[in-house]
Interface confidence: low
């Protein structure tokens, strides 16, 4: 995806996971200068910001995801020990200063490990 000088690549737009897995929401971006990266989470319960940061600086992680997420300078984030309630839409927005911006979405499906699946 490209817009106004920001390009954003999402290698896997849908991720299926089971509870307690650590999940990488993987992206790649390119732009002029150092952007601001913002991840938000949307579900039937509403939308909330997860984290915002400029690569190379400390990330501002929301209270709801403290100790549950880590960031990478390529824009990716990792979610630790996911639960079913983490299922939903994860939207990344990469913004160059006060202008150029691009967004992309990853859909995460988290399911319980069923007893039958183990046999």
């Amino acid at each position: 995806l490209q817009s106004q000088g920001v390009s954003l690549y999402i290698p896997q737009a849908t991720i299926n996971a089971t509870v307690k897995e650590d999940i990488l929401l993987s992206v790649e971006y390119s732009c002029h200068g150092v952007p601001t990266i913002e991840w938000t989470y949307s579900s039937n319960w509403g939308t909330q910001k997860i984290v915002e940061w400029k690569p190379g600086t400390q990330a501002n992680i929301s209270q709801s995801h403290k100790d549950r997420v880590c960031t990478f300078d390529n824009g990716s984030i990792q979610l630790f020990s996911v639960g079913v309630r983490d299922s939903g839409y994860y939207v990344i927005t990469v913004t160059e200063r006060l202008g150029s911006s691009q967004f992309g979405t990853i859909v995460l499906h988290v399911s319980e490990i069923l007893y039958e699946d183990l046999h």
């Epitope: 995806l1 817009s3 601001t36 915002e52 200063r97 202008g99 150029s100």
Partner: antibody, heavy 121, light 112 residues
Amino acid sequence: EVQLVESGGGLVQPGRSLRLSCAASGFTFSSYAMHWVRQAPGKGLEWVAVISYDGSNKYYADSVKGRFTISRDNSKNTLYLQMNSLRAEDTAVYYCAKDQYSVGATTYDYWGQGTLVTVSS
Amino acid sequence: QPVLTQSSSASASLGASVKLTCSLSSGHSSYAIAWHQQQPEKGPRYLMKLNSDGSHSKGDGIPDRFSGSSSGAERYLTISSLQSEDEADYYCQTWGSGIQVFGGGTKLTVLG
């Protein structure tokens, strides 16, 4: 529920000043960039100015640069537009709008109902 | 700076579908845009943000009847099962480094 309520519009003579306010509620005001957009009678929408979430970055349309100043008071959840040296062509309904993001000026996911500014002698 | 071009008017019958077009200027075909609706005597309302690949994210409470798509430098807003309250002005908007640009708007009339 997100609400943006503009005030401060009215009739003003050319060359005079006016300050518009926008009271925000229903979201974390200090986390988002904010815009002013205007609409002259019977015309389309025209972007006026944007300010980043912390007030550190401001941008203006060429038509108002040097005359208008956008500012915000995060402790009061209020956005302002100081309009100086007003001209007849500044006559419009002025809308305050919330950006979807905090630093980037992208698009607006909520709008106010607007306040009418009429510049006439 | 990008320029957005919209037809000044469009019309369609109640219950039918209509497709509104927003054209990006040469050299800006990769830009994302947004669509906003303005009903008579009201403030604008955000409908959706639309990427160059057609992916889009809609605003709160926007019905499924509204959808977006893209082809080259064209950005589309499709409204299906038209209702009387869809009669409104529709604006596309885009953004760049420190600037915001609106199209001229399309006035949609819902017939009969």
